[in-house]
């Protein structure tokens, strides 16, 4: 498919307060949370608000014509291109207080297509050829999704759909929240 594209608009996907299982401490009115209630984090952990805009999964709206050989769509179609960063994990829905985000490195999330939509377009062809009907698959929305170690190389490159990740059979270490629970919650969030 050929591209004749120009950017129209951009939508940022930034986790809203309602998406968090626990609000960041400085957004919490009640400052008396204890460690147990706060997932082991100190009450005044420094969440920098500037991180939110630095790490946003953006939906860029592009308008393009669909082409098939010499034929071109009568009207342009508008679709989304997913762009931007999805870290750090503490800004992702359901990550706060559940993932082991105190570690120096952790789950890598990417801004990838979430939903697609099918759109039927009419292609006009030169030389008096009859118009053709084509169905195109367009990105409808974007989201942050974790790269898992069960992605293959090609999926990693285009950030394909996530495989369900079976848990490895290791004995859990004693923690306030088990490693398995953390992992399941993080992945089910997406």
């Amino acid at each position: 498919q050929g591209w004749q594209a120009f950017k129209n608009d951009a939508t940022e996907i930034i986790p809203e307060l309602g998406e968090y299982p626990e609000p960041p401490p400085e957004l919490e009115n009640n400052k008396t949370m204890n460690r147990a209630e706060n997932g082991g984090r100190p009450p005044h952990h420094p969440f920098e608000t500037k991180d939110v805009s630095e790490y946003s999964c953006r939906e860029l709206h592009f308008t393009r014509y669909v082409t098939d050989g010499p034929c071109r769509s009568a009207k342009p179609v508008t679709e989304l291109v997913c762009s931007g960063q999805c870290g750090p994990a503490r800004l992702l829905p359901n990550a706060i207080g559940r993932g082991k985000w105190w570690r120096p490195s952790g789950p890598d999330f990417r801004c990838i297509p979430d939903r697609y939509r099918a759109q039927r377009v009419q292609l006009l062809c030169p030389g008096g050829e009859a118009p053709r009907a084509r169905k195109v698959r367009l990105v409808a929305s974007c989201k942050c999704k974790r790269l898992t170690r069960f992605h293959n190389q090609s999926e990693l490159k285009d950030f394909g759909t996530e495989a369900a990740r079976p848990q490895k059979g290791r004995k859990p270490r004693p923690r306030a929240r088990s490693a398995k629970a953390n992992q399941a919650e993080l992945e089910n969030a997406y």
């Epitope: 100190p42 420094p46 960063q85 750090p88 503490r90 570690r103 120096p104 490195s105 789950p107 490895k168």
Partner: antibody, heavy 119, light 110 residues
Framework: EVQLVESGGGLVQPGRSLRLSCAAS????????LHWVRQAPGKGLEWVSG????????DYADSVKGRFTISRDNSKNSLYLQMNSLRVEDTALYYC????????????WGQGTTVTVSS | QSVLTQPPSASGTPGQRVTISCSGS????????VNWYQQLPGTAPKLLIY???QRPSGVPDRFSGSKSGTSASLAISGLQSEDEADYYC???????????FGGGTKLTVL
Amino acid sequence: EVQLVESGGGLVQPGRSLRLSCAASGFTFEDYALHWVRQAPGKGLEWVSGIGWNDDEIDYADSVKGRFTISRDNSKNSLYLQMNSLRVEDTALYYCAGNNRGYGGLDVWGQGTTVTVSS
Amino acid sequence: QSVLTQPPSASGTPGQRVTISCSGSSSNIGSNTVNWYQQLPGTAPKLLIYSNNQRPSGVPDRFSGSKSGTSASLAISGLQSEDEADYYCAAWDDELELYVFGGGTKLTVL
């Protein structure tokens, strides 16, 4: 100034114990997860252990599991590493390091304390 | 032998662009964020890049990180003599359940 200062290193015989300490200053201690990273002479970096904001959030490298214990005392702004059953291969420069950014690397480091295990 | 593989050495002349690679597996770089550290001779390591490509404040924009699949790389443009140091990549490994470092790359500025 953000500072981590390690102490407690020294020469010790195999099988003996040693306790390392790391004193923090210049930042809110409770805001940081803390780690021990070691570097054997002429070698690369090796992560030893890490502790989150409470004692339930702890990880160890397999090479030290069951022998080393990491702990922190937020009231004293201090991190500790209790090293038991020391081996010759534990000889290294031990760094205390911290991070306060989720999954954001170790952004604060001490200068290290040397542990030599030799008979 | 390190879980993450780096070339033992790299070199370049002042002003040049140098890239250091870091190869891992699906259980570390393939699924977790990558950090890079710089260790100048006789000093403690310093965080250079976090979360694959983010620079902490104070790190010049000559340093940049990237990641693709199970490999990561650190690029240094406009090489300067003070960049001569050891560089380490690191990532959490889900199978080993520990923070793994690469073996380090000694960068020499000719």
